[in-house]
Interface confidence: low
């Protein structure tokens, strides 16, 4: 049985570490998926790298790496979103 | 480096009892979230059981009553207790902190 999306976002967005991540059981990170979005925009300065993830996920995703070495899942429709991974893109 | 290194796993009948461990290393486990999660033969990841820095507890429905999530800070160690045991809890189980999962012990759960 697959796990419902709900209670993914519990996995990971727990009371004591709720940065909205729900993403990525596995090491490697290309395997990563999302099961929830960020609610708010990350400050741009925040963000080190993204990646996407795999066309497998149920769900579409970018998941941010942030300086401090956080991962949080967003949105890839939200236009904050496609704004970040242009410019990192043309920073590369 | 985080390591996460699963112990327990095994073959019993069901309605039996297993009790999973989880070494953990290489970040502050008693401030972080930790979970466990499985994967059944052909199947995707399950969530089982979340317990949060304060001890607050999430349990999937499916092993909701039957399972106990708890762990210990001073040893850094995460466990499963799991009883009424039943053939469909075979799986691979995992033990995860963020975005890393340990290499899984295997639950059998068979006559």
């Known amino acids: 049985m697959q796990v419902s999306t709900a209670a993914l976002a519990v996995l990971l967005c727990t009371m004591a570490l709720c940065n909205q991540f729900s993403a990525s059981l596995a090491a490697d990170t290309p395997t990563a998926c999302c099961f929830s979005y960020t609610s708010r925009q990350i400050p741009q300065n925040f963000i080190a790298d993204y990646f996407e993830t795999s066309s497998q996920c149920s769900k579409p995703g970018v998941i941010f790496l942030t300086k401090r070495s956080r991962q949080v899942c967003a949105d890839p429709s939200e236009e904050w979103v496609q704004k970040y991974v242009s410019d990192l893109e043309l920073s590369a | 480096e985080v390591q996460l290194v699963e112990s327990g796993g095994g073959l019993v009948q069901p309605g039996g009892s297993l009790r999973l461990s989880c070494a953990a290393s290489g970040f502050a486990f008693s401030t972080n979230a930790m979970s466990w999660v499985r994967q059944a033969p052909g199947k995707g990841l399950e969530w089982i059981s979340t317990i949060n820095s304060g001890g607050w507890r999430s349990y999937a429905d499916s092993v909701k009553g039957r399972f106990t999530i708890s762990r210990d800070d001073g040893q850094n160690t995460l466990y499963l207790q799991m009883n009424s045991l039943k053939p469909e809890d075979t799986a691979v189980y995992y033990c995860?902190?963020?975005?890393?999962r340990g290499q899984g012990t295997q639950v059998t759960v068979s006559s």
């Open positions: 995860v902190h963020q975005n890393y």
